[in-house]
Interface confidence: medium
């Protein structure tokens, strides 16, 4: 009764294994000769040599022997500091990047079956960027007070610097601080400049937006891909390797569709108040036949900072007072095409494509930093009138303050979002065979190997 | 559709060196080894030898050793045979084939006639 | 090298006969034999791969068998287009080689 028992047990077990693997029957095991022309399964490759389908070998190992007509493939374990990522039949595993650098973080441990990613620590960027992990880390631009961050530092792109506009400062060295609005004052003491906030005298100030540095966030890296980095002025030390791109004009540009509506509302809300203030004058004349001062404090408009970058403000217009401490600086690029329309999402610029005379392709955030309010550009302007008696020439003066807030270019066709600039995807020109036993897993990437190593599989699996 | 496409006929004098080649199309062309084979006027085949496409590495049969040099174009998925110090016998229908365990595709066969 | 010797040279049969070729290996070529069919001013064209398994498109008169040394081609019914030279060869081992050919010709 036994050996029956022992038959059976073997029996299911065959039974279970078959329906384990469900092969076709004719052709169960490794090595078989496929019919010509046809492919191999998954997980078999084709060796021209032995005219076979053959096993592969799993992650984690390697081809050790390879197949001949009657004995299957031979795979063994890597070594210490080798691996092999894919299903292959490779005669050698590939060896594990170098250890990280100070200025790397080591995102994934070298192991059997993966190989050692480094990525840049906070504060660094990814300036030589490999297929997986970074080469070469910088670190991320500071600018200097004067300047504020126009785009800012991503796992793969240093931080752009810009000049801050007209009505706007930064007064601090670093990679995160924008440039903010100066605060408005009913009396100005020290008018504001690009590093340096306007001062006050008495009377609590107000402020065109909330107050405070705008932080942005600071990158961490992940996943690298490279990105022509763009030099922009700043005190910061910037690595030798990223050339100067020679003088542009000047900062967003000169010209633009939003001088006309801005023009407009300026012009308009000064004449309604020259009006009044004519009326109020002619009034005052006839009641109290007293001469009249008419005192106009016109305040600068002023943007939200960084406010819809799609659109170009007064500010960057250069339309209203230019503070005397401001700048534009030759490196700064010209609004083009591609400044409006780079999208954020770590697109790569490829090595060696340049955005179109602007050196640099400027990332757009597509909605405002500090607003919630959308893609519309918001001018503030406050005006302040004072219609003062001057008899007696005591200051009696009854203020009036206008204050308009327009939404002028809130188009969606305008919002940079979703528009994709095609940027050529140079990460895989750089994969040599070296580097990706891929090319050996079932690929059948049409360039001749050295001559060790083993044919291509029949078709992809 | 598969297709091999060889070059056209050649007439060599003695001592010459020839040059086919064979272009494929319609399939993988590292996927397949090439196997060069020949056949004289009346007569059986003869296998001259294969290249390993994906490698570039050829094996000659022992009869065209010194002879004969297999090489691809693989950017061209291109397969070329140049036979040396041809003579009077080497006057045959050259044909390219893919693969080795039963070839399943052949060239139309390119005449090279050896002639004084 | 191997040898491979076809018989007969020639077969003489009629359209709706049946033809069986010979092709004997000098060594052991375990299963790795093919079948072709060869017209004239043609290419040759593959009929059975690996002994007896029958290539796409092939029609199903025509069987292989055989193993080791002795192989088989066996076509059932002779149609007209069935007229021409067939040749085995062997891709067991360096430097691969085929049979003289048989003939097969209308009686």
């Known amino acids: 009764m036994a050996p029956v028992a022992v038959w059976a047990a073997l029996a299911v077990g065959l039974e279970l294994w078959a329906a384990a693997h469900a092969l076709p029957a004719q052709v169960a095991f490794t090595p078989y000769a496929p019919e010509p022309g046809s492919t191999c399964r998954l997980r078999e490759y084709y060796d021209q040599t032995a005219q076979m389908c053959c096993s592969k070998c799993s992650p984690g190992q390697h081809a050790k022997v390879f197949c001949t007509k009657t004995s299957d493939t031979v795979c063994d374990s890597c070594e210490d500091s080798t691996y092999t990522q894919l299903w292959n039949w490779v005669p050698e595993c590939l060896s594990c990047g170098s250890r990280c650098s100070s200025d790397q973080v080591e995102t994934q441990a070298c192991t059997r079956e993966q190989n050692r990613i480094c990525t840049c620590r906070p504060g660094w960027y990814c300036a030589l960027s490999k297929q997986e992990g970074c080469r070469l880390c910088a670190p991320l631009r500071k600018c200097r007070p004067g300047f504020g961050v126009a785009r800012p530092g991503t796992e793969t792109s240093d931080v752009v610097c810009k000049p801050c506009a007209p009505g706007t400062f930064s007064n601090t060295t670093s990679s995160t601080d924008i440039c903010r609005p100066h605060q408005i004052c009913n009396v100005v003491a020290i008018p504001g400049n690009a590093s340096m906030d306007a001062v006050c005298t008495s009377t609590s100030p107000t402020r065109s937006m909330a107050p405070g540095a705008v932080h942005l966030p600071q990158p961490v890296s992940t996943r690298s891909q490279h990105t022509q980095p763009t030099p922009e002025p700043s005190t910061a030390p910037s690595t030798s390797f990223l050339l100067p791109m020679g003088p542009s004009p000047p900062a967003e540009g000169s010209t633009g569709d939003f001088a006309l509506p801005v023009g407009l509302i300026v012009g308009v809300t000064a004449l309604g108040l020259l009006i009044i203030g004519v009326v109020n004058c002619v009034i005052m004349t006839q009641v109290k036949k007293k001469p009249l001062c008419l005192q106009r404090e016109a305040k600068v408009p002023h943007l939200p900072a960084d406010k819809a970058r799609g659109t170009q403000g007064p500010e960057q217009q250069h339309l209203l007072i230019t503070a005397p401490s401001s700048s534009s600086s030759s490196l700064e690029s010209s609004a083009s095409a591609l400044d409006r329309r780079a999208p954020t999402r770590n697109q790569p610029q490829a090595p060696g494509v340049e955005a179109s005379g602007a050196g640099e392709a400027r990332a757009s955030t597509g909605s405002s930093d500090s607003s919630p309010g959308g893609h519309g550009t918001q001018v503030n302007v406050t005006c302040i009138v004072n219609v003062c008696s001057s008899s007696d020439h005591s200051s009696q003066c009854s203020s009036q303050a206008s204050s308009t807030m327009g939404d002028t270019d809130s188009s969606p066709s305008e919002s940079p979002k979703d528009e994709q600039v095609p940027f050529s995807k140079e990460e895989c020109a750089f994969r040599s065979q070296l580097e990706t036993p891929e090319t050996l897993l079932g690929s059948t990437e049409e360039k001749p190997l050295p001559l060790g190593v083993p044919d291509a599989g029949m078709k992809p699996s | 559709q598969i297709q091999l496409v060889q070059s056209g006929a050649e007439v060599k004098k003695p001592g010459a060196s020839v040059k086919v080649s064979c272009k494929a199309s319609?399939?993988?062309?590292?996927?397949?080894?090439m196997s060069w084979v020949r056949q004289a006027p009346g007569q059986g085949l003869e296998w001259m030898g294969w290249?390993?496409?994906?490698?570039?590495?050829?094996t000659y049969a022992d009869d065209f050793k010194g002879r004969v040099t297999f090489t691809l174009d693989t950017s061209t998925s291109t397969a070329y045979m140049e036979l040396r110090s041809l003579r009077s016998d080497d006057t045959a229908v050259y044909y390219c084939?893919?693969?080795?365990?039963?070839?399943?595709?052949w060239g139309q066969g390119t005449l090279v006639t050896v002639s004084s | 090298e191997i040898v491979m010797t076809q018989s007969p040279a020639t077969l003489s049969l009629s359209p709706g006969e049946r033809a069986t070729l010979s092709c004997k290996a000098s060594?052991?070529?375990?299963?790795?034999v093919s079948w072709y069919q060869q017209k004239p001013g043609q290419a040759p064209r593959l009929l059975i791969y690996?002994?007896?398994n029958r290539y796409t498109g092939v029609p199903d008169r025509f069987t292989g068998s055989g193993s080791a040394t002795d192989f088989t081609l066996t076509i059932s019914s002779l149609q007209p287009e069935d007229f021409a030279v067939y040749y085995c060869?062997?891709?067991?081992?360096?430097?691969?080689?085929f049979g003289q050919g048989t003939k097969l010709e209308i009686k």
């Open positions: 319609g399939y993988t062309f590292t996927t397949y080894g």
């Open positions: 060594e052991n070529v375990v299963t790795y």
């Open positions: 690996g002994a007896s």
């Open positions: 060869g062997q891709s067991y081992t360096y430097p691969y080689t």
């Open positions: 084939a893919r693969g080795l365990y039963g070839v399943d595709y």
């Open positions: 290249i390993h496409t994906y490698s570039g590495v050829p």
